[in-house]
């Protein structure tokens, strides 16, 4: 499997809704026995690795799962929607968080971390990262624009 | 093989402070992980005090925020607790625990060092 | 904070018996996880992210469940099967919370 970022930059004034989307690419066939566990956080550059240091995005952790037969199936998990957030996952692959009414402290570096799970066995984790801009003040745009990544930047980091 | 394995004193008097380290052998401890201090009694069960990240960040119960330090010496391998103004209801088995930052579970735990809080 | 509630408290069952462990949440989290815990020894894990078994855990083990109940289930019940079993959650944070646990005896 793989995990892109169609966008690698969000740059939102206050008060808009912006949904942040990694995209996993799964080429193994259907029937085949892995399970994903998927979270959001937030992160930050480390000087290293991005996305190795993990913060709750509004003091929420989110949890998902799914089986490659089953692949729109989510573990229920605390109400996203009580900290402004919304989860999705759709049978194309697109895992997206979305943030209401964002303001100028959810501005940072995003991660989506998707785990493969084989016969009870963690294989692989890969993450997927952006940056949200929270712009305050007149001068701001009134809508959020996403910018693409660069092609040396579109690949997802994989963590043995 | 990952091992972490507690020490410190078994004998605290009320009002002092409770210190106890955690060495961790096999692994170093900031390459990854939360590295945490959990403790255990009969009335309260099992109690997750607080952890410090491979990075050096810190997190605390709130209930015992006000009174808890954790921290590292990377040049040994290792991380420490200090419990200040102990009472009774601190006596415990305290024992150190690694987790993985998801999905989030205790993988190593340390044997547990029985202290105990009394003049 | 996420209180986590388990029954029973002890549970006294034969040889190849089945075991029923539940693990419920005051409100709805994510994933549940397991440990075992033999008198004088630490916790061991058992079963995490709700149905995933650890290393080294034989299949008789098993979790499910989803939202505020989860259970564990021991298929068919060993001796050394005989212990407290705790279940853990991380999906309100800080703080981490377990359950009471529920002592197992297997004789």
């Known amino acids: 499997i793989k995990v892109t970022t169609p966008y690698s930059l969000y740059v939102c004034p206050e008060g808009q809704n912006v949904t942040l989307t990694c995209r996993i690419l799964d080429s193994v066939s259907k029937g085949h026995d892995a399970n994903f566990l998927k979270t959001w956080f937030l992160s930050s550059r480390g000087e290293v690795q991005v996305c190795k240091e993990h913060r709750p995005i509004r003091n929420f952790i989110s949890h998902h799962q799914h089986h490659r037969s089953h692949p729109a199936v989510n573990a229920s998990h605390d109400q996203p929607q009580k900290h402004g957030l919304e989860i999705a996952y759709d049978n194309h692959g697109n895992f997206s968080i979305t943030l209401h009414n964002v303001t100028l402290s959810d501005s940072g570096l995003y991660c989506c971390l998707v785990i493969e799970v084989k016969h009870h066995h963690p294989e692989r984790r890969l993450y997927g990262y952006m940056e949200l801009q929270v712009q305050t003040g007149k001068g701001s745009a009134s809508t959020c624009t996403a910018y693409p990544p660069n092609e040396q930047d579109s690949d997802s980091i994989t963590a043995a | 093989q990952v091992q972490l394995q507690e020490s410190g004193p078994g004998l605290v008097k009320p009002s002092d402070t409770l210190s106890l380290t955690c060495t961790v052998s096999?692994?170093?401890?900031?390459?990854?992980?939360?590295w945490n201090w959990i403790r255990q009694t009969p009335g309260k069960g099992l109690e997750w005090i607080g952890h410090?990240?491979?990075?050096?960040?810190?997190s605390y119960n709130p209930s015992l925020r006000s009174r808890v330090t954790i921290s590292r010496d990377t040049s040994k391998n290792q991380f420490s607790l200090k419990l200040s103004s102990v009472t009774a209801a601190d006596t415990a088995t305290y024992s150190c625990a690694r987790a993985l930052y998801y999905p989030w579970y205790f993988d190593v735990w340390g044997t547990g060092t029985t202290v105990t809080v009394s003049s | 904070e996420i209180v986590l509630t388990q029954s029973p408290a002890t549970l006294s069952l034969s040889p190849g018996e089945r075991a029923t462990l539940s693990c419920r949440a005051s409100s709805s989290v994510g994933y549940i996880h397991w440990y075992q815990q033999k008198p004088g020894q630490a916790p061991r894990p058992l079963i995490y992210a709700t149905s995933y078994r650890a290393t080294g855990i034989p299949a008789r083990f098993s979790g499910s469940g989803s939202g505020t109940d989860n259970t564990l289930t021991i298929s068919s019940l060993e001796p050394e099967d005989s212990a407290v079993y705790y279940c853990q959650q991380w999906s309100s944070y800080p703080p981490i919370t377990f359950g009471g646990g529920t002592k197992l005896e297997v004789k």
């Open positions: 410090i990240t491979y990075s050096g960040s810190v």
């Open positions: 096999g692994y170093s401890i900031t390459s990854d992980y939360t």
